[in-house]
């Protein structure tokens, strides 16, 4: 495919990435799928600057990001290393809380109303953010 040089309509550019901010809610898996269908992924926060940028755009609203531990360890959806990467958890989080009564623990990460992160039940219908890198090849066939 050809290399993407500018962001799609309704996406916001920041530091060579494009971001799309939902205004409705979906379960984490549905949000993840939505981003994949857009040739993107749920947002992967790699720095303090990116955290502040996303936080500015989403406001004080619970919003899914591309971080989960559904298979054991915490993983970013694009393969970015979790252990050495940026983290912004609320105090005492993540806690894999079972007391919500919805079955299981909490396996998906979201931005809370103050921007810090929390783990929550993946089925909750939160807003979400998609991200795609400008420098990666798009899946669209090249124009002949």
């Amino acid at each position: 495919g050809s290399e993407r040089t500018c962001c799609p309509v309704n996406w916001v550019e920041h530091e060579r990435s494009c971001y799309w901010f939902s205004r409705s809610g979906k379960a984490w898996a549905d949000a993840d799928n939505y981003c994949r269908l857009e040739d993107a992924h749920l947002v992967v926060v790699t720095s303090w600057e990116e955290q502040k940028f996303v936080q500015h755009h989403i406001g004080p609203v619970n919003t899914w990001m591309g971080l989960h531990d559904q298979n054991g360890p915490w993983k970013w959806v694009d393969g970015t290393d979790y252990e050495t990467g940026f983290k912004n958890w609320r105090p005492e989080q993540p806690d894999d809380w079972y007391g919500h009564g919805l079955g299981g623990g909490e396996d998906c990460a979201h931005f809370t109303d103050d921007g810090r992160w929390n783990d929550d039940v993946c089925q909750r219908p939160y807003r979400w953010v998609c991200e795609t890198e400008l420098d990666k090849a798009s899946q669209e066939p090249p124009l002949l």
Epitope: T46, S47, W48, E49, F86, K87
Partner: antibody, heavy 117, light 107 residues
């Protein structure tokens, strides 16, 4: 112009607490994170944590968790840093700093805290 | 935590000299690095942010470069007021960490 003015020097005994203030002017106080950094005599700079004046969220360096509390009073555009259970190695100049783009773009003048019995 | 190292730890130079200070991060920090100047008894003063952007009001003889793990601060022509200690700082992830400093003094 942006200004951060800190409270005066303090002398404390080991085990006591100290509360340093930092009054901001020249910009929207609630719009930017506030950081606290300290510097022991003749030593380098050490980040202690941040507070966001808009929502009171905090993030403390692990080294200081359980001993530091960062607060703010938006009505007077002032941030506070309280450090408890003081030890002699907490003797340092404590700075507040405004968050900038991948940096601390404005700093207070510093507050010397001396811990001595 | 991300460790920051600086070299040299001190440098003796004369007015008009070109001075280069390097900073290395123990892991990749993209370009999220700042440089500060500190004089005795004073607070640090921001010179460079985002590795290469000059802070407003800072003379153009100061410049920064690098990304990833290796960064450089250059003073193209040292002036009398530039004798000070210089610190790098990573602003990529918590806890934010500083280099140990480089003291620039008169030869």
């Amino acid at each position: 112009q942006v200004q951060l003015v800190q409270s005066g020097a303090e002398v404390k005994k080991p085990g006591a607490s100290v509360k340093v203030s930092c009054k901001a002017s020249g910009y929207t106080f609630t719009g930017y994170y506030f950081h606290w950094v300290r510097q022991a005599p003749g030593q380098g700079l050490e980040w202690m944590g941040w507070i966001h004046p808009n929502n009171n969220a905090t993030n403390y360096a692990q080294k200081f968790q359980g001993r530091v509390t960062m607060t703010r009073d938006t009505s007077i555009s002032t941030a506070y840093m309280e450090l408890s259970r003081l030890r002699s190695d907490d003797t340092a100049v404590y700075y507040c700093a405004k968050d900038g783009r991948s940096s601390f773009d404005y700093w207070g003048q510093g507050t010397l805290v001396t811990v001595s019995s | 935590d991300i460790q920051m190292t600086q070299s040299p730890s001190s440098v003796s130079a004369s007015v008009g000299d070109r001075v280069t200070i390097t900073c290395r991060a123990s892991q990749v920090i993209s370009r999220w690095l700042a440089w500060y100047q500190q004089k005795p008894g004073k607070a640090p003063n921001l010179l460079i942010y985002a590795a290469s952007s000059l802070q407003s009001g800072v003379p153009s003889r100061f410049s920064g470069s690098g990304s990833g793990t290796d960064f450089t601060l250059t003073i193209s022509s040292l002036q009398p007021e530039d004798f000070a200690t210089y610190y790098c700082q990573q602003a990529n992830s918590f806890p934010f960490t500083f280099g140990p400093g480089t003291k620039v003094d008169l030869k």
